[in-house]
Amino acid sequence: LVVTPPGPELVLNVSSTFVLTCSGSAPVVWERMSQEPPQEMAKAQDGTFSSVLTLTNLTGLDTGEYFCTHNDSRGLETDERKRLYIFVPDPTVGFLPNDAEELFIFLTEITEITIPCRVTDPQLVVTLHEKKGDVALPVPYDHQRGFSGIFEDRSYICKTTIGDREVDSDAYYVYRLQVSSINVSVNAVQTVVRQGENITLMCIVIGNEVVNFEWTYPRKESGRLVEPVTDFLLDMPYHIRSILHIPSAELEDSGTYTCNVTESVNDHQDEKAINITVVESGYVRLLGEVGTLQFAELHRSRTLQVVFEAYPPPTVLWFKDNRTLGDSSAGEIALSTRNVSETRYVSELTLVRVKVAEAGHYTMRAFHEDAEVQLSFQLQINVPVRVLELSESHPDSGEQTVRCRGRGMPQPNIIWSACRDLKRCPRELPPTLLGNSSEEESQLETNVTYWEEEQEFEVVSTLRLQHVDRPLSVRCTLRNAVGQDTQEVIVVPHSLPFKV
């Protein structure tokens, strides 16, 4: 490329006309501020291409860079682009105007930047000042570019004197941006809503000062746009939140909501999604099975638990034999319903040191204006067995009887056993089980009674022994689901004068 005049810097008179020519082996074009001004392009007989730019009635605003470049798509090497800088000293123009974005200089690290205040006359003395300061800053000035150096975050102005008049530039704002990789988190006030209720989602990013949020959501696909609100949170630095609020949700608003966050300085981005379900009306659903018969052990604490899903949050009531239960002041009953996830609940009835009277029919009812569910079960209080009495007698018939009486819930089983060798029983010899078999020469009679008030069974068992010829250890063992109890008596033959 050949430019005439060659420059690289020209000082031209205001109101004059000036011609710039550029020629090359391929089509060429003049560019000014990324535009192509009107120019005459030609091709000579020797195959040389040229472009002539005529500058007429020059003013200070024509001051600036002019480029000649090849007018095709080939990559631009340094020799394929010629730069020319023209000054048109003009006392009516102070500082050359800047685009608004040139007044804000953003940087992400400590690096040299240029404050681009430029004048039309290369002979003018230009100084740089803090916006509110009079002292000129010791920063080098290039008439073609401006002041270059490392600047702190603050506002600056340039000053020059044209004739006897002091001229100030616009203020330039230097701002160091906080930029880091992006990590987005998205949450919703509720992920389940009823139609007509609001959907509110929040997208949060920490560690970046300037980011762009973009939401995609079901409503957007149908062309119904919602304007998100960006909030700069003050609880920690660089904490930015975008809020997407959809009033009066419809069933079609169910679906995936995605927040995409980009940071344009380093081109970082991240996105997160969340699913929202819009339901026609609220619901309450039991999760898992609870048996219709539940057990608790006397004097022990027992927690009965029901798990269910509901939206909106329900009211939960517990009943015993159709009477409403509440936390008792004596601390015998504790009721609690806790939210274990957005729509999942665990309701617990705790009976502290269970009493017999707490057996009965229990119901949990969970309800709201749209739905209800209830679950009932019978609570049985299990009472460990006790042997209340073990006695031996010899009626006139000559046989000997041993009577064992005990209580418990559920119904106790009774086991009789005997040991004939007192020295070795029960450590060395296992006791022999006694029953109704004739060879053991014993008979058994057992009666069971249920005591309604005490809610437990009483077992009375009588063991008849036909002839006892030597001392016999007889043991009565009562056993049920929650324990066992044993008592023992020594039965001696009629002929022996003593009984232990």
């Epitope: 906080q178 609100v229 960006t230 909030d231 700069f232 949170l233 003050l234 920690m236 630095p237 939140r241």
Partner: antibody, heavy 118, light 113 residues
Amino acid sequence: QVQLVESGGGFVQPGGSLRLSCAASGFTFTNYAMSWVRQAPGKGLEWVSAISGVGGSTYYADSVKGRFTISRDTSKNMLYLQMNSLRAEDTAVYYCAKAPHWGPFGSWGQGTLVTVSS
Amino acid sequence: DIQLTQSPDSLAVSLGERATINCKSSQSVLYRSNNKKFLVWYQQKPGQPPKPLIYWASTRESGVPDRFSGSGSGTDFTLTINSLQAEDVAVYYCQQYYSTPYTFGQGTKVEIK
């Protein structure tokens, strides 16, 4: 030129209420976080409350939480502090101040005096 | 909450001499990824609102004389007034703006000796 002008201060009995206002001009109101800072007579500065720019999230000092409410009207460029259940220890000059988000209080009003006494 | 403790509570310095005020933070106010310290120094004269002098712990506010300077780490900060002038008589406060609740130091009164 940034201007912040507080009003609404005055004399009030303990348990009473007062609403302070701050008229803002010379800057884009929603681009800045706004705060109330108070200074009891002869004492130091105490931050009271803040509201963020665009979204309007609110923050309070523990000493006023539940009693004071910060709010704003962006159409009028007004900042407010509703003070309820006032106590003698709330007696102070109340300043409104503006700050860029995550930045210092660059501009302050002249303050309005609130006196709580029986 | 971040507590700020200033020392001394008051300071008497001769004209033209140096005044040094310290501010200690109970936790760091340094944001590591950009090395910014979220601390500002204010000057307050009787009957006036506070005026910011130094922000980001060391950046002077436009129009503030260069005899005022700030320095510090993430938790220990210093405001220095080189060559104290009569008009510098005031109360000086540090304040953290790292996180709410924003907190101030208790103030340091600077007087002429």
